[in-house]
Each structure stands twice: as C-alpha cells, then as structure tokens.
Interface confidence: low
C-alpha cells in the first residue's frame, strides 16, 4: 500500500503518501477551529507508469497508452484512496462545539 | 457534471473530461481484442482550483492551501467519476468470446 | 499543423517591462504545458518556466519575481510578463510546447516540441 | 539546482566521421530517462532529436542515437552529414527541483 509505512521510508518519484502538515489559520485562514492549530493532512503525488498500483482498468490502459505514446497528455494521477476523519473543537458564541470532519486525513494514495 | 455534455462544448482549462480515442493495436499493443478496433475511452486533466468539483473535504482543504500557499506542490488533481464498462469480442483459439471489461471508458472527472 | 509564433519583442531601457505574446495553433492550450526559453547573443539556452494545461505557473529560480507567465486559452496565447530589465535580459525569446502533460506535480520529458520561431529582446539605454 | 554539464563544447569533424557528445548532470534526471537532445541552427529555434534519453522524434535519422541512465547520457551521430553541422544541447528534467528544467552548455559541431 502506498501508505506512510512505505512512502515516509522510502525516496520515490512514483505515485505516493508526502507529508503535509496545514496550519489552520496560516495555511487555509480558517480562524473559527480552536483546537487543534492544526494537523498532518499529507497529499499524494508522484509519477504513474504503468501498472505502478493502477485504481481502475482505464488507468491501467490510460498508463500503458502514456508509455508507448510518450507524447501524449493523457496520463494517470496519483489521489488519495484512504482517508479518515478529524476530531475539532469550535465555538459558537461562547458554547464549546467538537465535530468530526469527514475526509481530512489522507493515509494511503493510488493512480487513478 | 464534468462530462461530455459539459466539457466537450467549453474551452476549459479547469479539470474536465478530455476526448481521447485508443486503438488497441496501435496505442497499447493489444492484438487479442477482435472487436472493436478501439474505443472513446477518454480522459480526465486540468487545474483543480479551490472548489472546482472538488471530491472530498481533503481536495477543499488541498486547494485552498494551494490558493494561499501557490509555490507548494500539494495540489488535487483531475481525476474520473463515473466509469463506464467495453463489451469486446475476443478468441481462445477459434472460439469467439464476448467480455465486459469493467471500467473502461471515463464518463465525468473530478477533482480528488 | 501545430505552431507557435512569438511576439512583442523589441528594444527596452534598463528598469523597464515588456510583455511577450506566444500565439499557438493546431492544439488546445487546455491540455498542453507551453516554455519560454531564452537564449543570449552567441549563448546557451535557458529555460525560464512554463504555464501547465491547468493555469499553474513555474518558474526558474532565477527568473522567479521578475517574470510571469500566464495564458488565455480563448485566445490561444500565452504571455511572459518581464519586470526590471537588465541588459543581461538581452536574449532571443522562444515559446516552446511540452511533448507530454502529466497530471503528477514531479516531473516532465523535458521534450519540448514544437518551438516557435523566437523573438528579439533588447535591453539597452 | 541541478546542473547540465556537456562535452567537449566544440568540436571539428568531418563528413562520414562517427561523432560523439556527452551530457553529465549534477543530479539524478526524472525517472532517471527524462533527458533530450537538441540540435539548433544558426537563427533558427532548437529542433527536438531525441527524447526520454533514446527514444529517436519522428523524422529524426536514424543515424542519431541517444543512451544513458540517471546522470550520464550520450549522443551519438554514427555518420556525420553536411546538414549536421550545429551546436546540440541536453535538456533534463527533474524531481524536486526548484528548477523543473535545465539545459546543457551546448556543443558547437563544425566542420574540419
């Protein structure tokens, strides 16, 4: 899986987990979220060759296509496939408010 | 939707459905497939700005860092949706087999 | 057949801007990256950035600040802003197309093709 | 940044002589084959000879050939022509670089 147990310990070009840590205030002006300041979102990004972990048939072909048709601009993406949520603290007048956001975190990446 | 009906009929330099025609023969290499000669399969590409048909609340976050912080790296990128399967004919010897091969053709993009 | 022409070159003092003008034809800047490489009287070539099929701009560390790049796609065009000339700036400009976009941040073929005839930038008092 | 070192910077040959050109970078390129070769013409832009370290532009004679991995490649003209007086230039691309590009000093080919 092109997770951080594989990606943070190795150097690779190809598809894969980068880390990203995103302030809250400085990186996205988000003021209203008081705890955490922030959190480690990470991204993905790297290369797609072929058969380089593929998410459907298309990226598959469309990898394939890119290899013997170098020039073309048509080519796979490195996205996030796992994510998982954030636990925050807000407020609402003076009413402290914790909340779940979806998708926040991306743990592993994959070619689409 | 970021699909043919859409992206087909505007100049549009955001993330969007790309035509792309692949042959089989020519553009893979594949000599098993019969029929068809080759198919639409089509493609996904473009810039992913802050709310561009974005995926997940990670592709918001992603994009708005990328919008204050435009030197990073960390950016979503255009990705498919809705993929379609390709009924294709061919032989195992000279016995003629039909197959759908799952998600094959792109039908609308996103950004993830 | 898939072409670009460059425009806007000319003689400017030292301090000064100008905008270049790379027209393309025979392919959609939607979906290929465009460069502008320059080149110096009787020098090398010098890559300088380029704009991708999605809008993001790249730039050289050198030429980072002092220059933009940006493109109308409507228009077919795509522009290099160039702020506080120096006489070093002196240099043919070129416009050249990536053979391959991909949608990875991390690297191209470094295969530009086709490239525009080039334009005369001039910075002299 | 990475830099692109090519030798010798000029050379005198004659028609039928086997020519051969160094690249050397400073750097590892992308992919490790994400180097080309250009030859250019008095007033005239570069013209794109080889790509992906070997792989021969539609157009270009066969008589050009490009080999080399990682940060040493090699250009090689098996029999030189009259129209082949030029200077040719390395082009690479790279991966986590400021600098997604560099060019070579160049290599002046002239006739002896």
């Known amino acids: 899986a092109l997770d951080a147990a594989y990606c943070f310990r190795n150097v690779q070009d190809n598809c894969c987990l980068r880390p990203l840590y995103i302030d809250f205030k400085r990186d996205l002006g988000w003021k209203w979220i008081h705890e955490p300041k922030g959190y480690n979102a990470n991204f993905c990004a790297g290369a797609c060759p072929y058969l380089w972990s593929s998410d459907t048939q298309h990226s598959r072909v469309l990898s394939l296509y890119n290899t013997i048709n170098p020039e073309a601009s048509a080519s796979p993406c490195c996205v996030s496939q796992d994510l998982e949520p954030l636990t925050i603290l807000y407020y609402i007048g003076k009413t402290p408010k914790i909340e779940q956001l979806s998708n926040m975190i991306v743990k592993s990446c994959k070619c689409s | 939707a970021l699909d043919a009906a859409y992206c087909f009929r505007n100049v549009q330099d955001n993330c969007c459905l790309r035509p792309l025609y692949i042959d089989f023969k020519r553009d893979l290499g594949w000599k098993w497939i019969h029929e068809p000669k080759g198919y639409n399969a089509n493609f996904c590409a473009g810039a992913c700005p802050y709310l561009w048909s974005s995926d997940t609340q990670h592709s918001r976050v992603l994009s708005l860092y990328n919008t204050i912080n435009p030197e990073a790296s960390a950016s979503p990128c255009c990705v498919s949706q809705d993929l379609e399967p390709l009924t294709i004919l061919y032989y195992i010897g000279k016995t003629p087999k039909i197959e759908q091969l799952s998600n094959m053709i792109v039908k609308s993009c996103k950004c993830s | 057949e898939q072409q670009l022409v460059e425009s806007g070159g000319g003689l400017v003092q030292p301090g000064g801007s100008l905008r270049l003008s790379c027209a393309v034809s025979?392919?959609?800047?939607?979906?290929?990256?465009v460069n502008w490489v320059r080149q110096a009287p009787g020098k090398g070539l010098e890559w300088i950035g380029y704009i991708s099929y999605g809008g993001s701009a790249y730039y050289a560390s050198w030429a980072n600040g002092r220059f933009t790049i940006s493109k109308d796609s409507a228009k077919n065009s795509v522009y290099l802003q160039m702020n506080s000339l120096r006489a070093e700036d002196t240099a043919v400009y070129f416009c050249?197309?990536?053979?391959?976009?991909?949608?990875?941040?991390?690297?191209?073929?470094?295969?530009?093709?086709?490239w525009g005839p080039g334009t005369l930038v001039t910075v002299s008092s | 940044d990475a830099q692109l070192t090519q030798s010798p910077s000029s050379l005198s040959a004659s028609v039928g002589d086997r020519v051969t050109i160094t690249c050397q970078s400073s750097q590892s390129v992308y992919n490790n084959n994400y180097l080309s070769w250009f030859q250019q013409k008095p007033g005239k832009p570069p013209k794109l000879l080889i790509y992906g370290a070997s792989t021969l532009t539609s157009g270009v004679p066969s008589r050009f050939s490009g080999s080399g991995s990682g940060t040493d490649f090699t250009l090689t003209i098996s029999s030189l022509q009259p129209e082949d007086f030029a200077t040719y230039y390395c082009?690479?691309?790279?991966?986590?670089?400021?600098?997604?590009?560099?060019f070579g000093g160049g290599t002046k080919v002239e006739i002896k």
């Open positions: 082009a690479g691309g790279y991966s986590g670089s400021s600098d997604k590009y560099a």
């Open positions: 025979g392919f959609s800047l939607s979906s290929y990256t």
């Open positions: 050249a197309r990536h053979m391959q976009v991909g949608g990875a941040p991390t690297g191209s073929m470094a295969a530009f093709d086709p």
